[in-house]
């Protein structure tokens, strides 16, 4: 048998905020006319299911968000590459669980400058996961221990910190007409998750009094 890595490499899920994309690379002997077909299944199931819309494709990604939408389930996906010359190779992912493996994007935050304070309002983060009644769940719905960590860089040596589960925060006692750098992260201790930071550079308003 030939080495499957000649045609196909690095088959893996890339998951952000529960959007689960299967990606892969062609091997050294892959060509632009190599076609890829994708299948998926859940833990312990015998049969692989062909993913509609991802059969004999030439791109190197396939969106499996809907098919892998149960965040308590374990999933696998596999890719079969077929070259123009008729050679084929199949590779599968490791077990994938979105709750465990999804990475968190930076939160969506509005930073509002005031004269002696900066207010930060964190907006709920929607996910593609739907509740029983059809509405989309937010990260906050899914991770019950989710909290926000906020930091305000006052100068090179001094930072102010706030944190909690609420959505509205305010840093008080600031100097008017001064620029501050705010960073806001989502933290989920149970799953040891931290989002990339949202950053806002904000100048407090001048004191007109």
């Amino acid at each position: 048998p030939e080495d499957p890595s000649d045609l196909l490499q690095h088959v893996k899920f890339q998951s952000n905020n529960f959007e689960n994309i299967l990606t892969w690379d062609s091997g050294p002997e892959g060509t632009p006319d190599t076609v890829y077909s994708i299948e998926y299944k859940t833990y312990g199931e015998r049969d692989w299911v062909a993913k509609k819309g991802c059969q004999r494709i030439t791109r190197k990604s396939c969106n499996l968000t809907v098919e892998t939408g149960n965040h308590t389930e374990l999933y696998y996906a596999r890719v079969t590459a077929v070259s123009a010359g008729g050679r084929s190779a199949t590779k599968m992912t490791d077990r994938f669980n979105s709750l465990q493996h999804t990475a968190l994007k930076p939160p969506d935050v509005t930073c509002i400058p005031k004269v002696r304070s900066i207010q930060m309002i964190v907006h709920p983060t929607p996910t593609p996961i739907r509740a029983g009644d059809g509405h989309r769940l937010t990260l906050e719905d899914i991770f019950h221990d989710l909290f926000y960590h906020l930091e305000l860089q006052v100068n090179r040596t001094y930072q102010m910190h706030l944190g909690g589960e609420q959505r509205e925060y305010e840093f008080f006692g600031l100097t008017p007409d001064t620029e501050f750098l705010g960073t806001i992260m989502i933290c989920v201790p149970t799953w040891s998750k931290k989002s990339a930071p949202y950053m806002c550079r904000v100048r407090t308003l001048p004191d007109r009094t």
């Epitope: 312990g44 308590t72 199949t90 992912t93 490791d94």
Partner: antibody, heavy 116, light 113 residues
Framework: EVQLVESGGGLVQPGGSLRLSCAAS????????MNWVRQAPGKGLEWIGE????????TYNQKFKGRFTISVDQSKNTAYLQMNSLRAEDTAVYYC?????????WGQGTLVTVSS | DIVMTQSPDSLAVSLGERATINCKSS????????????LAWYQQKPGQPPKLLIY???SRESGVPDRFSGSGSGTDFTLTISSLQAEDVAVYYC?????????FGQGTKVEIK
């Protein structure tokens, strides 16, 4: 037709090492998980560990971690079980078995005897 | 580790009669994602590797005669051979795949009375 054929068993002295092979045919080894299971003479079945042949990711029964190593050569469509520091109680028939939860195809097994 | 305990250790049944093997797990095998039980049954004849009979506690493997059936949920499971045939003489094992390490029962030997 899916077939698994083990080889590499035999007599080995206590403290010695042995590498077992499991040649897969009838399918690409990278398309399903592969496991090793052993059975001591007249005894029950004991799961050693598994490998995802596509990624090389392994999970072991803690009892065997450190002494036994599972690997794959994709180009040969073959899985391996490297066994080190062997003791008399490792005497058993060693099977490779396919799938990720339960085991749908098994090899015929290869006998490993650890004795001085 | 999940401990799997089979009973009886051996069983002698007349040809054409029903054989019942029990398997008890030390914790529930109910998999919350699909509400199925992560239990498999195997048959092993002398000098041969085990053969998969049943998975998900009650799903019969392709090609397995319908006299073999699996039932049970949670921690208590049963393999039933509805009408024992001569070729069913073997050792039968249950196996859990709920969590690592996967573990087997000690086996039940089925003989003809």
């Amino acid at each position: 037709e899916v077939q698994l054929v083990e080889s590499g068993g035999g007599l080995v002295q206590p403290g010695g090492s042995l590498r077992l092979s499991c040649a897969a045919s009838g399918y690409s080894i990278t398309a399903e998980y592969m496991n090793w299971v052993r059975q001591a003479p007249g005894k029950g079945l004991e799961w050693i560990g598994e490998i995802n042949p596509s990624t090389g990711t392994t999970t072991y029964n803690q009892k065997f971690k450190g002494r036994f190593t599972i690997s794959v050569d994709q180009s040969k469509n073959t899985a391996y079980l490297q066994m080190n520091s062997l003791r008399a109680e490792d005497t058993a028939v060693y099977y490779c078995a396919r799938f990720d939860a339960y085991f749908d195809y098994w090899g015929q097994g290869t006998l490993v005897t650890v004795s001085s | 580790d999940i401990v799997m305990t089979q009973s009886p250790d051996s069983l002698a049944v007349s040809l054409g009669e029903r054989a019942t093997i029990n398997c008890k797990s030390s914790q529930s095998l109910l998999y919350s994602s699909n509400q199925k039980n992560t239990l498999a049954w195997y048959q092993q004849k002398p000098g041969q590797p085990p053969k998969l009979l049943i998975y998900w506690a009650s799903s019969r493997e392709s090609g397995v005669p319908d006299r073999f059936s699996g039932s049970g949920s949670g921690t208590d499971f049963t393999l039933t051979i509805s009408s024992l045939q001569a070729e069913d003489v073997a050792v039968y094992y249950c196996q859990q795949y709920y969590s690592y390490p996967f573990t087997f029962g000690q086996g039940t030997k089925v003989e003809i009375k």
